[in-house]
């Protein structure tokens, strides 16, 4: 058993059937010695009585708040939540597996720039009696600050039959150095309680690696002079670090009909404009990358060609 | 040519070569990373590895004030990553397929740090620490994290010398 | 063609030593390696070890406790496998066989012990 | 050590009927939670040692009567229609770690 908060403990139980399960002693925060009785939950049946209370945990039904009270006068509260361990493997029933980029992802995390300021979301289908408290490190033996926000519903999606629901949260690194090269990662520790249940998810990655452009913006065509041709501009995003000659990004134009199955044709730069042939009811689309670390490309900008 | 005594090297070649390098270097290890490293010996095997650090000078005020703290810094790193490329770790086995970008990624490495120190002027260099595996699987842990580590050290470089190129040249 | 040509069969005193020679022809010697294989009668295969003669590491079967060197001499394409402090139990066939062991840069591609040797069979007897 | 472990020792089939032979090591021959370094070899009687299957793929002119399977600890090598020249003894190899090892191997016969 360990303290999540204050007032609040964490039982950690071996799961499967007829486990012997926890003994817990619970204390009453209390200068009193007699008197004392317990109950748990909204239960007012006495389940003992003493400054102490011995109870063997074993199922979600011996978890919940505990109350120690004096002559109906409550002393102190504490709240049991439990952790369970299946075959040495802690339960994920709160989150949703995101498959990527690989399986067991529960997590997802990127960053615009390298300033040092992330955000991580993740999904899950349960609506109610959720809470999920998020902390962060960069590295873990000698830990270096990093300060998140609290974690807030970002969106609801229906998935077949399920809604499916996406939380999200945003850190920052106190002492970001953006032009270094990191060789510790940062850690993201994310606890979530769903009702008695408590599990906890962590993610480890170098900012370098979850670098994500937006995308280029002010796309613009301008067409020359007797020719199908198109001068395609634009400009770095504003998200983007800077200076630009330091912070470089590299860029993917690409022609797009408006059937899927026609050939695309993409041209890869480094300039912020490129000379296109602009078909019919096709349409451009840029968009761009780091330029020295491959790290994911931003989402499309795009504008038709007509 | 970095000149010894604080002269300017040639950032225009340094930058062509530097972004070959990034090139190259993602060329020998396209993966973002995502092997199931967790069931291998996952020792730290590549901590000793030069880092350019925030103290070194390599960020755009930095290099304004004196390039060379951040150049001296990026040549021990390309030595270092230079020997490890042509030690045992990837010249044994299991031996690369023979068209393996590791051979000009080896090259490259080396002519960019002869550019940034010429023949007579010597920066000292950091040991490399001798890690021959007793199993050769081993050695594609060892490779893998080597490359991980180099993608990110010559992403700074390549940053480093595009910007001195811009704004630091002649 | 590729062939792996042995020395002939042995007999030899318990206590003494042994040394079995391997002639490879039809490849470049030094981009492959030699494995060393043994088979005791009506017995199971045993791996003594493996000598790569490009980068000079050699791996060896602890079993045989510094009883077993394995050498190689590019400039006649020979290797050499010699057993010392011989006893009944080391009364087997020994086979050479070609290695290839190769990788892309950071992933599994291929371990192949593909081309044999016609095997020598060494009798401990006294 | 990896101690490989092969069953059966010997098995008798019909020719035209399914063989199948197994193999378990001692611990995970996996690397990097992908690749199996496992093979299989057949060797018939006065020869020496063939190679069949390298890192769980198949070498090239192997019969496609030949597949196998498995990965972690546990592999498999079946022959789905045994034919006459089929009988030999298969052994599987680890290089996942040195010393390699070989299975005991499995002797297969006609019934």
């Known amino acids: 058993i360990w303290e999540l908060k204050k007032d609040v403990y964490v039982v950690e139980l071996d799961w499967y059937p007829d486990a012997p399960g926890e003994m817990v002693v619970l204390t009453c925060d209390t200068p009193e010695e007699d008197g004392i009785t317990w109950t748990l939950d909204q239960s007012s049946e006495v389940l003992g009585s003493g400054k102490t209370l011995t109870i063997q945990v074993k199922e979600f039904g011996d978890a919940g708040q505990y109350t120690c009270h004096k002559g109906g006068e409550v002393l102190s509260h504490s709240l049991l939540l439990l952790h369970k361990k299946e075959d040495g493997i802690w339960s994920t029933d709160i989150l949703k597996d995101q498959k990527e980029p690989k399986n067991k992802t529960f997590l997802r995390c990127e960053a615009k720039n390298y300033s040092g300021r992330f955000t991580c979301w993740w999904l899950t289908t349960i609506s109610t009696d959720l809470t999920f408290s998020v902390k962060s490190s960069r590295g873990s033996s000698d830990p270096q600050g990093v300060t998140c926000g609290a974690a807030t519903l970002s969106a609801e999606r229906v998935r077949g039959d399920n809604k499916e629901y996406e939380y999200s949260v945003e850190c920052q690194e106190d002492s970001a150095c953006p032009a270094a090269e990191e060789s510790l990662p940062i850690e993201v520790m994310v606890d979530a309680v769903h009702k008695l249940k408590y599990e906890n998810y962590t993610s480890s990655f170098f900012i370098r690696d979850i670098i994500k452009p937006d995308p280029p913006k002010n796309l613009q065509l301008k067409p020359l002079k007797n020719s199908r041709q198109v001068e395609v501009s634009w400009e770095y995003p504003d998200t983007w670090s800077t200076p630009h000659s330091y912070f470089s990004l590299t860029f993917c134009v690409q022609v797009q009909g408006k059937s899927k199955r026609e050939k695309k044709d993409r041209v890869f730069t480094d300039k912020t404009s490129a000379t296109v042939i602009c078909r019919k009811n096709a349409s451009i689309s840029v968009r761009a990358q780091d330029r020295y670390y491959s790290s994911s490309w931003s989402e499309w900008a795009s504008v038709p060609c007509s | 040519r970095a000149v010894p005594g604080g002269s300017s090297p040639a950032w225009t070649q340094c930058q062509q070569l530097s972004q070959k390098l990034c090139t190259l270097a993602w060329s020998a290890h396209p993966l973002v990373g995502h092997m199931d490293l967790r069931e291998e010996g996952d020792e730290e095997t590549t901590n000793d590895v030069p880092h350019i650090q925030c103290g070194d000078g390599c960020d755009p005020q930095g290099l304004r004030d004196n390039s060379q703290f951040c150049l001296q810094r990026i040549h021990q790193g390309l030595i270092f990553y230079e020997k490890l490329l042509g030690s045992d770790i990837f010249t044994g086995e299991p031996s690369l397929l023979p068209d393996s970008p590791v051979g000009q990624l080896h090259a490259s490495l080396l002519g960019l740090s002869q550019l940034l120190q010429p023949e007579g002027h010597h920066w000292e260099t950091q040991q490399i620490p001798s890690l021959s595996p007793s199993q050769p699987w081993q050695r594609l842990l060892l490779r893998f994290k080597i490359l991980r580590s180099l993608q990110a050290f010559v992403a700074v470089a390549a940053r480093v010398f595009a910007h001195g190129a811009a704004t630091l040249s002649p | 063609q590729v062939q792996l040509v042995q020395s002939g069969a042995e007999v030899k005193k318990p206590g003494s030593s042994v040394k079995v020679s391997c002639k490879a022809s039809?490849?470049?010697?030094?981009?492959?390696?030699i494995t060393w294989v043994r088979q005791a009668p009506g017995q199971g295969l045993e791996w003594m070890g493996e000598n790569y003669p490009r980068s000079g590491n050699i791996y060896y079967n602890e079993k045989f406790k510094g009883r077993v060197t394995i050498t190689a001499d590019k400039s006649t394409s020979t290797a050499y496998m010699e057993l010392s402090s011989l006893r009944s139990e080391d009364t087997a066939v020994y086979y050479c066989a070609r290695a290839e062991f190769i990788s892309t840069v950071v992933a599994p591609y291929y371990y192949a012990l593909d081309y044999w040797g016609q095997g020598t069979l060494v009798t401990v007897s006294s | 050590d990896i101690v490989m472990t092969q069953s059966p020792d010997s098995l008798a089939v019909s020719l035209g009927e399914r063989a199948t032979i197994n193999c378990k090591a001692s611990?995970?021959?996996?690397?990097?939670?992908?690749?199996?370094?496992l093979h299989w070899y057949q060797q018939k009687p006065g020869q020496p040692p063939k190679l069949i299957y390298n890192?769980?793929k198949p070498e090239s002119g192997v019969p496609d009567r030949f597949s196998g399977s498995g990965s972690g600890t546990d592999f498999t090598l079946t022959i789905s229609s045994l034919q006459a020249e089929d009988v030999a003894v298969y052994y599987c190899?680890?290089?996942?770690?040195?010393?390699?090892?070989f299975g005991g191997g499995t002797k297969v016969e006609i019934k």
């Open positions: 890192l769980a």
């Open positions: 190899l680890q290089n996942k770690e040195v010393p390699y090892t």
């Open positions: 039809g490849y470049t010697f030094t981009s492959y390696g």
């Open positions: 611990k995970k021959v996996t690397i990097f939670g992908s690749t199996s370094a």
